[in-house]
């Protein structure tokens, strides 16, 4: 066959679907690779062709669109499974072509089994709710296009294994689940099961997401530097190791980049000649507030090093702060025999 622009296997779009449920999968060519949509391609005389490679096989084969009850079908740029089977797992390719043009992309499709409590190997999206922030909602995801607006599905919500009924602060409202006031106890996996009829059959869509309750923007503050501080003096003799921790607390802020860095006499450690190492550790609270610690270490400090200024800087979307460490050279204790004895008039 003639040359075809092959975008390869698009592993970024690792599609996971539940066994025995409908699945609609759009050809990724129009979503991510080509600058035109299916309608434009179709009206230009291009044809969309689907084929697949079964799991653990190398052989590409056409998709069988003649299965009973049209179990697999194609509609415009969408491949439909009504419903999926476990052995539908494999790499699927959609190819757009005519006599002069060809472009194709493959993507992996994994059909996943779930247990009665909706546990499965499915990668779950995470939805963050602000703690004690007033009413917040989550919406049953990825159900658009499965049924027409004239069809009224039934939706049942679960937290873990339990149907959500008469929960204190969580109220199912159709496709939405409302949290009247989110608390840490609301952390967990939430599942919506959407049931709808189609051509005399009943289908179920199961969607699970993880709810994580995080710090509220109402409580967010600029970074707080706990160390260095004015209560601790790093008093060292030349030759000793100088260790200064910079410990910074960051409020949780959605999409904020938290940064911590040291400067020595105004320069980043990488830009100076002294042998300094920086080790960083990060910890998170239950509401995803972050504490970063960067320990500045000079193995064998010199008297020159003890005259430098060591400043810890921190920045988030809320602002920038800095604190200097109090560093000084230890004054050697007087030796009794010489200094003190002379001081007492001994000869």
């Amino acid at each position: 066959s003639e040359r075809c622009d092959d975008w390869g296997l698009d592993t970024m779009r690792q599609i996971q679907v539940f066994e025995d449920e409908p699945a609609r999968i759009k050809c990724p060519l129009f979503e991510h690779f080509l600058k035109f949509n299916y309608s434009t391609a179709h009206s230009a005389g291009l044809t969309l062709i689907w084929y697949w490679t079964r799991q653990d096989r190398d052989l590409e084969e056409p998709i069988n669109f003649r299965l009973p009850e049209n179990r697999i079908s194609k509609e415009k740029d969408v491949l439909w499974f009504r419903p999926t089977l476990l052995n539908d797992t494999g790499n699927y390719t959609c190819m757009l072509r005519n006599t002069t043009y060809c472009s194709k992309v493959a993507f992996p499709l994994e059909v996943v089994q779930k247990d009665s409590c909706f546990n499965s190997p499915m990668k779950l999206p995470v939805h963050k709710l602000y703690i004690e922030y007033g009413i917040q909602r989550i919406t049953c995801p990825n159900v658009d296009g499965y049924f027409p607006s004239s069809v009224k599905p039934t939706i049942t919500w679960y937290m873990g294994c339990y149907k959500i009924q008469n929960f204190n602060n969580v109220i199912p409202e159709g496709m939405n689940l409302s949290f009247l006031i989110a608390l840490i106890s609301n952390n967990g996996n939430y599942t919506c099961v959407v049931t709808y009829p189609e051509n005399g059959r009943t289908f179920h869509l199961t969607r699970t997401l993880t709810v994580k309750v995080v710090g509220s923007p109402k409580n967010a503050v600029p970074p707080v530097i706990h160390s260095p501080n004015d209560h601790v003096v790093y008093e060292k003799e030349p030759g000793e190791e100088l260790l200064i921790p910079c410990t910074v607390y960051f409020s949780f802020l959605m999409d904020s980049r938290n940064e911590v860095w040291w400067t020595i006499d105004g320069k980043k450690p990488d830009d100076i000649t002294i042998d300094v190492t920086i080790n960083e550790s990060i910890s998170h609270s239950r509401t995803e507030d972050e504490t970063r610690t960067q320990i500045l270490s000079i193995k064998k400090v010199t008297s020159e090093d003890l005259k430098r200024s060591y400043v810890c800087h921190a920045r988030s979307a809320k602002g920038e702060v800095a604190k200097a460490a109090k560093v000084k050279q230890k004054v050697p204790a007087p030796r009794y025999t010489v200094e003190l004895a002379c001081g007492f008039g001994a000869t």
């Epitope: 530097i225 260095p228 501080n229 004015d230 003096v233 400067t263 006499d265 105004g266 320069k267 200024s309 400043v311 800087h313 920045r315 602002g319 920038e320 800095a322 604190k323 200097a324 109090k326 000084k328």
Partner: antibody
């Protein structure tokens, strides 16, 4: 309100030492670093150093090490800067300045004394 | 030491004009730059800190911007009382250094 009170002027002989004072009021003296800034007549501003009144820890601009010595007297809420071996180069206005309470010394200075003019002349 | 360079020693302007003073740092100082106004015979007065934050009680005709090494200070509509010397200062790392000052003259 916050006030930093400085004497207006000091006339000194070359080679002598001078101790410039800065009396603080309107805040807790030990809560905030005190900075000192030099301004020669018709010239710009130079940071000399700073002192933490809570423990008398000092940090200096190396240019002024050996020239300026910072100290505090907690009982009178007063910060001092001693200048030694005075020369005509030391003739300048010397300001004390501070930031908000609770801040480390990495900060700008919203509060300034009115400055002490030190004149070194034979 | 970090050197702060104010390229204009003098700037002449008229009441109502917009004036912009620039300041360049010899090293990246992030946003740790303050601007001060000093009138003849007075102490410096803080106008702007952290590059763009107006200090309490400072009129909103005074604004600051910049990050890294390049900073600007703007008076949107100059008033007669704005006659002064304006200094930039880095409060990023000691020794804290000031620009040489820009003397704003009113025509």
């Amino acid at each position: 309100q916050v006030q930093l009170q400085q004497p207006g002027a000091e006339l000194m002989m070359p080679g002598a030492s001078v101790k410039v004072s800065c009396e603080a009021s309107g805040y807790t003296f030990t809560d905030s670093w005190m900075h000192w800034v030099k301004q020669r007549p018709g010239q710009g501003l130079e940071w000399i150093g700073a002192i933490d009144p809570s423990d008398s820890y000092t940090t200096y601009n190396q240019k002024f090490t050996g020239k300026a010595t910072l100290s505090v007297d907690e009982s009178s809420n007063t910060a001092y800067m001693q200048l030694s071996s005075l020369t005509s180069e030391d003739s300048a206005v010397y300001y004390c300045a501070r930031y908000y309470s609770g801040s480390n010394y990495i900060s700008p200075f919203p509060y300034w004394g009115q400055g002490t003019l030190v004149t070194v002349s034979a | 030491d970090i050197v702060m360079t104010q390229s204009h020693k003098f700037m002449s302007t008229s009441v109502g004009d917009r004036v912009t003073i620039t300041c360049k740092a010899s090293l990246d100082v992030s946003t740790a730059v303050a601007w001060y106004q000093q009138k003849p015979g007075q102490s410096p007065k803080l106008l702007i800190y952290s590059a763009s934050y107006r200090y309490t009680g400072v009129p909103d005709r005074f604004t600051g911007s910049g990050s890294g090494t390049d900073f600007t200070f703007t008076i949107s509509s100059v008033q007669a009382e704005d006659l002064a010397v304006y200094y930039c200062q880095q409060h990023y790392s000691p020794p804290f250094t000031f620009g040489s000052g820009t003397n704003l003259e009113i025509k």
